[in-house]
């Protein structure tokens, strides 16, 4: 069989959500003496970045400027050492954001609620959707998807103080075009008599995985990127 | 820049039909709703309809539905708007607009509006 | 449809004045509420949208309030440039409609 290096890790900087007419910036992390990276866009060539030196950094990241909804779509990268490729990434859907229109959000019984209570919220956008998706902030990978003409219902059963936080709802034109996000809807959730108000409020850290870390090599590395380089040759 | 151009002036005879061009330029069309409206001499601004260029998702005006065609072409960036049965209160300037960035229902670049007359 | 009602539909004042323009809905369009300006022959120019947000490039001097069914769009110092046709827009359903329009001149 053909022999490949171990696939690379495709991430998008900050969100994989980017308003439309922004930069998106998508990481590609392969391996310390990778001298070519490639991304690939809906199962074509999309961009091409060489690191300088390539022995000095485990990836490259690929800026995509003005974003619009023909950029939105199922990136992956690859990369090569020497002559070997590496298999392809796992795909990375990247969403175009402010298309066309703003939803509304609510909730019901209200956005204050005791922990227990059943909560809906209702999502609203009267034009060209039929998708919504309710996203936490600092969740924003925990997308909730419910369907409806005009109005779609995020049934949360009962709420615990789990719940807390800001929530935002979008209407989707399709998976990869998404419309400016509503306002954001504060859910407050408050405990059990007995202990009231003390359970904390989530923190609303940005989500840990949408960040880059490509690093420079150190001499530790450099002993295991020549160890791993004298390994392929061995191979070959 | 952004720029929305508009077709020349027409004179049409009562019963015909026109077709006024709004061309787009500096950003992505399909990326933004176009609306058309008119402004009949002396008058306020009326709302016909709006098209999705992506989609080619139409609403109208209740009042231009039998009256207006929006449609859309991709492939050169130009919303139409055809307007058939006319008559001489159809004379007025058409405008085309972009409806903006901000998500927030206000059209924030328009055309330089296209003068139809009709008289017999 | 919502109606939007302007006034005044026309108003003079001197360079420097504050003016004032009123437009109220029919019912309640919460803030979705724009203003443009007109000069004669002109298409019409977005200054503000969603009751208070300027739009890119237009001068501080134009401002707007309100919420609901009446909304106020102020010039703060008229200037000899701002003699125009001022109408404001419900952006809450459609169809969009638009108010009758404010004629400002100078006196």
């Known amino acids: 069989p053909k022999q490949t290096l171990p696939k690379p890790i495709i991430r998008a900087e900050s969100t994989y959500m980017v308003p439309k007419e922004k930069q998106a910036t998508l990481c590609c992390q392969g391996s310390y003496g990778a001298v070519e990276y490639q991304l690939h866009f809906e199962g074509s060539l999309f961009a091409v970045e060489r690191p300088k030196p390539p022995e000095r950094i485990n990836g490259v990241k690929f800026h995509i400027p003005d974003m619009n909804s023909r950029k939105a779509g199922r990136y992956s990268c690859i990369y090569r050492v020497g002559e070997l490729w590496s298999e392809r990434s796992d795909l990375l859907d990247l969403v175009v954001t402010e298309m066309y229109d703003t939803p509304t959000l609510s909730v019901h019984p209200g956005p204050e609620v005791t922990s227990g209570e059943k909560v809906t919220f209702y999502c609203r956008l009267d034009t060209a959707t039929s998708m919504f998706l309710l996203l936490k902030e600092g969740r924003s990978r925990d997308v909730q998807r419910s369907y409806g003409k005009v109005q779609a219902e995020f049934p949360m059963g009962p709420v615990t103080t789990a719940h807390r936080g800001s929530y935002r709802c979008f209407g989707s034109y399709n998976n990869y075009a998404w419309s400016f996000p509503s306002e954001p809807v504060k859910l407050l959730v408050t405990g059990d008599i007995e202990n009231t108000s003390l359970a904390p409020t989530d923190p609303t850290f940005p989500d840990s995985w949408d960040t880059c870390l490509l690093t420079r090599e150190t001499g530790l590395q450099k002993d295991l990127a020549l160890w791993d380089h004298t390994a392929q040759n061995l191979l070959r | 820049q952004v720029q929305l151009v508009q077709s020349g002036a027409e004179v049409k005879k009562p019963g015909s039909s026109v077709k006024v061009s709004c061309k787009a330029s500096g950003y992505t069309f399909t990326d933004y709703v176009i609306n058309w409206g008119r402004q009949a001499p002396g008058q306020g601004l009326e709302w016909i309809g709006e098209?999705?260029?992506?989609?080619?998702?139409?609403y109208y005006n209740e009042k231009f539905k039998a009256k207006a065609t929006i449609t859309a072409d991709k492939s050169t960036s130009t919303a139409y708007m055809e307007l058939s049965s006319l008559r001489s209160e159809d004379t007025a300037v058409y405008f085309c607009?972009?409806?903006?960035?901000?998500?927030?229902?206000?059209?924030?670049?328009w055309g330089q509006g296209t003068t139809v007359t009709v008289s017999s | 449809d919502i109606q939007m009602t302007q006034s005044p539909s026309s108003l003079s004042a001197s360079v420097g004045d504050r003016v004032t323009i009123t437009c109220r809905a029919s019912q309640d369009i919460s803030n979705y509420l724009n203003w443009y300006q007109q000069k004669p022959g002109k298409a019409p120019k977005l200054l503000i949208y969603?009751?208070?947000r300027l739009h890119s490039g237009v001068p501080s001097r134009f401002s707007g309030s309100g919420s609901g069914t009446d909304f106020t769009f102020t010039i703060s110092s008229l200037q000899p440039e701002d003699i125009a046709t001022y109408f404001c827009q419900q952006g809450n359903t459609r169809p969009w409609t638009f108010g009758g329009g404010t004629k400002v001149e100078i006196k």
């Open positions: 607009a972009r409806r903006g960035r901000y998500g927030l229902y206000a059209m924030d670049y």
């Open positions: 969603y009751t208070s």
């Open positions: 098209i999705y260029p992506g989609s080619g998702t139409n």
